[in-house]
């Protein structure tokens, strides 16, 4: 089978900060020099795509500047971090992973992270 | 509302060549991969060619290999596919398909129809 | 390239009939990248299943997919007169992307 395989968490629990980091992983089938990252988030049937980044093996991963998503690679593993997450966000978390260069064309999709978010409980007003 | 429209299509001679427009809207054109997808009369469908995000990323059939040659402009939300060296066997309904965040092709345009004739 | 091969070619079948597709793989398909659409007369073809068995928004329930590996299957409960037309299987899950040559669902 030349299909390629996606793991991730089944769960990750987002900190009261409101981050949330996982391990995305993919078995290549081929020997590729560029792969693109996409994080989708998906709600009911309905799929956006929270951020992308497009690196080069061996080289760092670059969200846009304005990405909510940071993260670095290792071969065939990349560390994912969400950041600026509340509680509404609490989701189904898809890694996606493309071979795009050389051919031929891979596509991989992850089951899914659910990521759950829990906003911190406002401090109460202190007397001093 | 999410729609792709096709235009270009014609009557045009053995060898010579055609360029196909299609334009995008409804969505966030840069962040799908689009296609193009033939259908000859009568006959099944048949990918032609992709092209990815940025534009910097393309593949292509063997059948249509070093004569088409598929480009984007983001800037206009609209993908093109240039045809050259045509054949009588290109002559078919060519359709631009968006890609979905899954990978399936989830929209598609109506199609325009290429007819290469002497 | 993977081949992709469907049975029957043609299907003749009453409204209110279940309707069996089959698409057999040359090679195993991962089941997250196998969809099939459906195409009426002079029309594009339309998304109706995703991942083997996800159903595509506004695809009524009586469509369904199943299957895994090589051999795939979409269901049909009970054929409606607006079910009629050609479907289509697809993997997408590595270049090139192919089609499988179509099933023709008839009115009997």
């Known amino acids: 089978c030349k299909a390629m395989h996606v793991a991730q968490p089944a769960v990750v629990l987002a900190s009261s900060r409101g981050i949330a980091s996982f391990v995305c992983e993919y078995a290549s089938p081929g020997k590729a020099t560029e792969v693109r990252v996409t994080v989708l988030r998906q709600a009911d049937s309905q799929v956006t795509e929270v951020c992308a980044a497009t690196y080069m093996m061996g080289n760092e991963l670059t969200f846009l500047d304005d990405s909510i998503c940071t993260g670095t690679s290792s071969g065939n593993q990349v560390n994912l971090t969400i950041q600026g997450l509340r509680a509404m966000d609490t989701g189904l978390y898809i890694c996606k992973v493309e071979l795009m260069y050389p051919p031929p064309y891979y596509l991989g999709i992850g089951n899914g992270t659910q990521i759950y978010v829990i906003d911190p409980e406002p401090c109460p007003d202190s007397d001093f | 509302q999410v729609q792709l429209v096709e235009s270009g299509g014609g009557v045009v001679q053995p060898g010579r060549s055609l360029r196909l427009s299609c334009a995008a809207s409804?969505?966030?054109?840069?962040?799908?991969?689009v296609h193009w997808v033939r259908q000859a009369p009568g006959k099944g469908l048949e990918w032609v060619a992709v092209i990815w995000y940025e534009g910097s990323n393309k593949f292509y059939a063997d059948s249509v290999k070093g004569r088409f040659t598929i480009s984007r402009d983001n800037s206009k939300n609209t993908l093109f596919l240039q045809m050259n060296s045509l054949r009588a066997e290109d002559t078919a309904v060519y359709y631009c398909?968006?890609?979905?965040?899954?990978?399936?092709?989830?929209?598609w345009g109506q199609g325009t129809m290429v007819t290469v004739s002497s | 390239e993977i081949v992709l091969t469907q049975s029957p070619g043609t299907l003749s079948l009453s409204p209110g009939e279940r309707a069996t597709l089959s698409c057999r793989a040359s090679?195993?398909?991962?089941?997250?990248?196998l969809a099939w659409y459906q195409q009426k007369p002079g029309q594009a073809p339309r998304l109706l299943i995703y991942g083997a068995s996800s159903r595509a928004t506004g695809i009524p329930d009586r469509f369904s997919g199943s299957g895994s590996g090589t051999d795939f299957t979409l269901t049909i409960s009970r054929l409606e007169p607006e079910d009629f037309a050609v479907y289509y299987c697809q993997q997408y899950g590595s270049s090139p992307w192919t089609f499988g040559q179509g099933t023709k669902v008839e009115i009997k």
């Open positions: 409804g969505f966030t054109f840069n962040s799908y991969g």
């Open positions: 090679q195993s398909v991962s089941s997250s990248y």
């Open positions: 398909v968006r890609a979905g965040y899954l990978g399936a092709f989830d929209i």
